[in-house]
């Protein structure tokens, strides 16, 4: 395990990756749920989308997000060629025109109407810290997670290897 | 460039363990995952498992649960995987691999180990 | 766990023909499915990713297409170079699977 100083190291570089291509490498449309099995929902609420997180009632309808997914080249810091690997980058949207962003200030979660090329607020870097779980981290702010916070996604801090497979930033994508 | 260089070729006796390692360079060990995966003589590829990029995880096919181990060493940037109470039907060529992106499974495994022949015959 | 089954098993073709692989998934799932190429004695090589990614030095005679449970890999013209065994794989639910293979082999 890295350690504290592990975590930042490895995500330390996140802000200088550059995404190869704007077009997305693929895109999946699937529903989200926490690892406890709670539904990310998003509701229509005075001209802007609220995001929850709840318990949907027996065959109620899953609300339904489409990720699309970018390759990132990383910058090397052992290998010769200037490139050390890729990652993947994932934009999430779950109606036409709006984006989940990181509002790293406040801390959220926020849904955003917004044109391409979008900001890099719009992107997350995917993780598998969990055989069928994946974890999504802040381009913009290496080692925070979206999570779930009061039955709200929120950004949380990782700081350390260990908290990687914190339930609370692990999430299902299920195409049901 | 990257490598995945593993240790010799085993022959062993049922019922006893063996333990594979793959050295990996080239790259930025702690961001990857690695996965074994297997061939029997003549057969096709089966999955034996992986572990985290971080080493807190592994997981493992049901077909030899409880048999294996999976651990790596971000010291040397060695992974292994032990294989105990060996039969003959464990006799094969196991791969180690790394995956296509940091932090996560997706995208196939772009390389591959030379491989280890492990051979279980009393 | 998702099964995987590739048809035919055995394709006999002349080089310069086009040769179409087929993958079948027993659930539909992401499109995290690999093609690998293997030849004698050698490790598999990864050819295609995301069901239609072409893998980096991997000639462009190759690709992939499908989505859901229905994938196929395409060799567009083959090269005396291209006969060996291929397989898919999926990634998307554990335990991960590989279909069965593939052989490809001269007419």
């Known amino acids: 395990a890295f350690g504290i100083s592990g975590v930042q190291k490895y995500t330390r570089a996140l802000h200088d990756s550059s995404i190869t291509g704007i077009s997305p490498i693929t895109e999946y449309l699937a529903s989200l749920s926490t690892y406890n099995d709670q539904s990310i929902t998003f509701a229509l609420e005075d001209e802007s989308y609220e995001i929850y997180v709840e318990d949907l009632k027996k065959d109620e309808k899953k609300d339904k997000v489409l990720l699309s997914y970018y390759e990132s080249q990383h910058p090397s810091n052992e290998s010769g060629d200037g490139v050390d690997g890729k990652m993947l980058m994932v934009t999430l949207s779950p109606t036409k025109d709006f984006w989940l962003h990181a509002n790293n200030k406040e801390h959220s979660v926020e849904l955003h109407k917004c044109e391409k090329p979008l900001p890099d607020q719009a992107f997350f870097v995917l993780h598998n810290m969990h055989s069928n779980c994946v974890s999504f981290e802040c381009k913009t702010d290496p080692g925070v997670f979206i999570g779930v916070k009061d039955n709200h996604l929120a950004l949380i801090k990782v700081d350390s290897s260990e908290n990687l497979c914190t339930e609370n930033i692990l999430f299902k994508l299920s195409e049901t | 460039e990257v490598q995945l260089v593993q240790s010799g070729a085993e022959v062993k006796k049922p019922g006893a363990s063996v333990k594979v390692s793959c050295k990996a360079s080239g790259f930025t060990f702690n961001n990857y995952w690695m996965t074994w995966v297997r061939q029997a003589p003549g057969q096709g590829l089966e999955w034996m498992g992986s572990i985290t990029y971080t080493g807190g995880g592994t997981y493992y096919p049901d077909s030899v649960k409880g048999r294996v181990t999976m651990t790596r060493d971000t010291s040397t940037s060695t992974v292994y995987m032990e294989l105990s109470s060996l039969r003959s039907e464990d006799t094969a060529v196991y791969y180690c691999t790394r995956a296509n992106y940091y932090y996560n499974t997706y995208g196939g495994f772009p390389y591959w180990g030379q491989g280890t022949l492990v051979t279980v015959s009393s | 766990e998702i099964v995987l089954t590739q048809s035919p098993a055995t394709l006999s073709l002349s080089p310069g023909e086009r040769a179409t692989l087929s993958c079948l998934a027993s659930e539909g799932f992401s499109n995290d499915l690999a093609w690998y190429q293997q030849k004698p004695g050698q490790a598999p090589r990864l050819l295609i990713y995301?069901?239609?990614r072409l893998q980096d030095g991997i000639p462009a005679r190759f690709s992939g297409s499908g989505s859901g449970t229905d994938f196929t890999l395409t060799i567009s013209s083959l090269e005396p170079e291209d006969f060996a065994v291929y397989y898919c794989q999926q990634g998307s639910k554990y335990p991960l699977t590989f279909g069965g293979g593939t052989k490809v082999e001269i007419k």
């Open positions: 995301a069901a239609s």
